[in-house]
Amino acid sequence: EQVKHSETYCMFQDKKYRVGERWHPYLEPYGLVYCVNCICSENGNVLCSRVRCPNVHCLSPVHIPHLCCPRCPDSLPPVNNKVTSKSCEYNGTTYQHGELFVAEGLFQNRQPNQCTQCSCSEGNVYCGLKTCPKLTCAFPVSVPDSCCRVCRGDGELSWEHSDGDIFRQPANREARHSYHRSHYDPPPSRQAGGLSRFPGARSHRGALMDSQQASGTIVQIVINNKHKHGQVCVSNGKTYSHGESWHPNLRAFGIVECVLCTCNVTKQECKKIHCPNRYPCKYPQKIDGKCCKVCPGKKAKELPGQSFDNKGYFCGEETMPVYESVFMEDGETTRKIALETERPPQVEVHVWTIRKGILQHFHIEKISKRMFEELPHFKLVTRTTLSQWKIFTEGEAQISQMCSSRVCRTELEDLVKVLYLERSEKGHC
């Protein structure tokens, strides 16, 4: 029987890096240090070296925040990269940071007692459905800080965070890796090419969901490059380095515990947290500041970059092993991601073949655990939860269509990152 060895990787500041991966370190109190390059070497060691700047042959070289070395003015990047105020543009209207506004027609299944509240925060538009209270007066009035109309004299209304609340980015906002729900049925209608497996994969524009369909949605908010340079994300005035996670603090809604954002290079990726239906203990407890109930007295056993308890649970949800195989031949890259399940004991293999950035072939197949155990070319890369796997397959549905008609360089790699369960920040699940 073949033993699957974990791939070599480097740990640096609690983050995992693949062999060959390069990055600038994030060092307190300086932030991202662009004059230092780090690389993950084959033996798992991190090698960092200072950038040597070439001599510049001009009188007044210019320093650019996200570049280490000074440059001559004629070799500068385009002017639209300059830092501007963090305003938001939505439907042709510019909103200032912190400004609240109402959007129409964003949520298709909006109930009569709901309205769409949006806010501009650090150049990103956040929208959610707000459930308005019953009005007891004949002539309600509009107030600046809420999309709900109120009776004169009523105080400011709080955001009612129900299970059906959705946080999403408006449909006209460009998001390169926006993974929408695909509504595919488990029994696939597999035809040659395999793409017909996802009949409902929606296009980015207008792909909006009702509150019943919110599960597993990744909301990707793009940090506009003209607002921020370098590999950091800015949210609510705070700077987060690549890989860091946080709960968004939205002016209209406060800290939203059931939404988790992660900084992916310069883009915030936010997803709604879904709590497990079953817990490994009899009486899970609700704790302030946490989205899901937790089992009392359970100390999670820390693994590099991941936290599971001794039964392989992550934040109360069962985890399953994920394997990967990457094979390159004749300018073609075949990447296989495999999830092993216990019930039934089988492995679901997702196969992607990409040539020159264009998806040539994509399919999903299931094989028995027994057969999979005999395949020597797979390596164990992580453990994931069913909810993360669901997000992965939904994203896959969209990018399988997107990448078959245009060049994709990192889409699949970015999507695979969804499967890695980051160490829960300050115990937040």
């Epitope: 696939p188 209608s189 296989k336 039934p344 196969v351 197949e365 299931k366 057969m371 005999e374 070319h377």
Partner: antibody, heavy 121, light 107 residues
Framework: QGQMQQSGPELVKPGASVKLSCKTS????????ISWLKQKPGQSLEWIAW????????TFNQKFTGKAQLTVDTTSSTAYMQFSSLTTEDSAIYYC??????????????WGAGTTVTVSS | DIQMTQSPASLAASVGETVTITCRAS??????LAWYQQKQGKSPQLLIY???SLEDGVPSRFSGSGSGTQYSMKINSMQPEDSATYFC?????????FGSGTKLEIK
């Protein structure tokens, strides 16, 4: 797709051994799974085993464990199957086949022409 | 091992006729099913994989369907060159196992 060229027919005595060869071309041998199958005249097919050419790791149908031995020669892109302690029950056509690209399930897309083995005293 | 029960064992069809061959697995094989065609004295040839994906170069009159334990292959408009023995095979578990075969002849 590639091609698989098998060695010629064999007439062997009971108790003896036979080594069949399967020379491949037109695909990357080192990343291939080469399977061997048995078919008796007028009957269905039976999968014997596979060998992963990249590592030489092989997996057998329990029925043939101890009976067959698989090896590869990566320099000549050739797979071999040695069948030992032959009986008349081992008289059959033996095929080598390569599984379909991209798939983990054993879908045999490329086949050799088969080698007829006759065990007779 | 997973047992594959194929039917019918043999049949004769006229040119232009539609032919259906069925295969039942002893347990769920999750679409991991192939159909092969074998002509007299030749090696088998892969026709359909993954239950319903047509192998390159195979005429479109061949099609596969099914799920769970029940699968079938259809030949729309039988042609003289389709006279052969057809085998189904599960590719889900080790060892992969074949059906007993269906001998298809021209009327």
């Amino acid at each position: 797709q590639g091609q698989m060229q098998q060695s010629g027919p064999e007439l062997v005595k009971p108790g003896a051994s036979v080594k069949l060869s399967c020379k491949t071309s037109g695909f990357t041998f080192s990343s291939s799974y080469i399977s061997w199958l048995k078919q008796k005249p007028g009957q269905s097919l039976e999968w014997i085993a596979w060998i992963y050419a990249g590592t030489g790791a092989s997996t057998f149908n329990q029925k043939f464990t101890g009976k067959a031995q698989l090896t590869v020669d990566t320099t000549s892109s050739t797979a071999y199957m040695q069948f030992s302690s032959l009986t008349t029950e081992d008289s059959a056509i033996y095929y080598c086949a390569r599984k379909r690209a991209y798939y983990e399930g054993l879908y045999f897309a490329v086949w050799g022409a088969g080698t007829t083995v006759t065990v007779s005293s | 091992d997973i047992q594959m029960t194929q039917s019918p064992a043999s049949l004769a069809a006229s040119v232009g006729e539609t032919v259906t061959i069925t295969c039942r697995a002893s347990e769920n094989i999750y679409y991991s099913l192939a159909w092969y065609q074998q002509k007299q004295g030749k090696s088998p040839q892969l026709l359909i994989y993954n239950a319903n994906s047509l192998e390159d170069g195979v005429p479109s009159r061949f099609s596969g369907s099914g799920s769970g334990t029940q699968y079938s292959m259809k030949i729309n408009s039988m042609q003289p060159e389709d006279s052969a023995t057809y085998f189904c095979k599960q590719a889900y578990d080790l060892p992969p196992t074949f059906g007993s075969g269906t001998k298809l002849e021209i009327k």
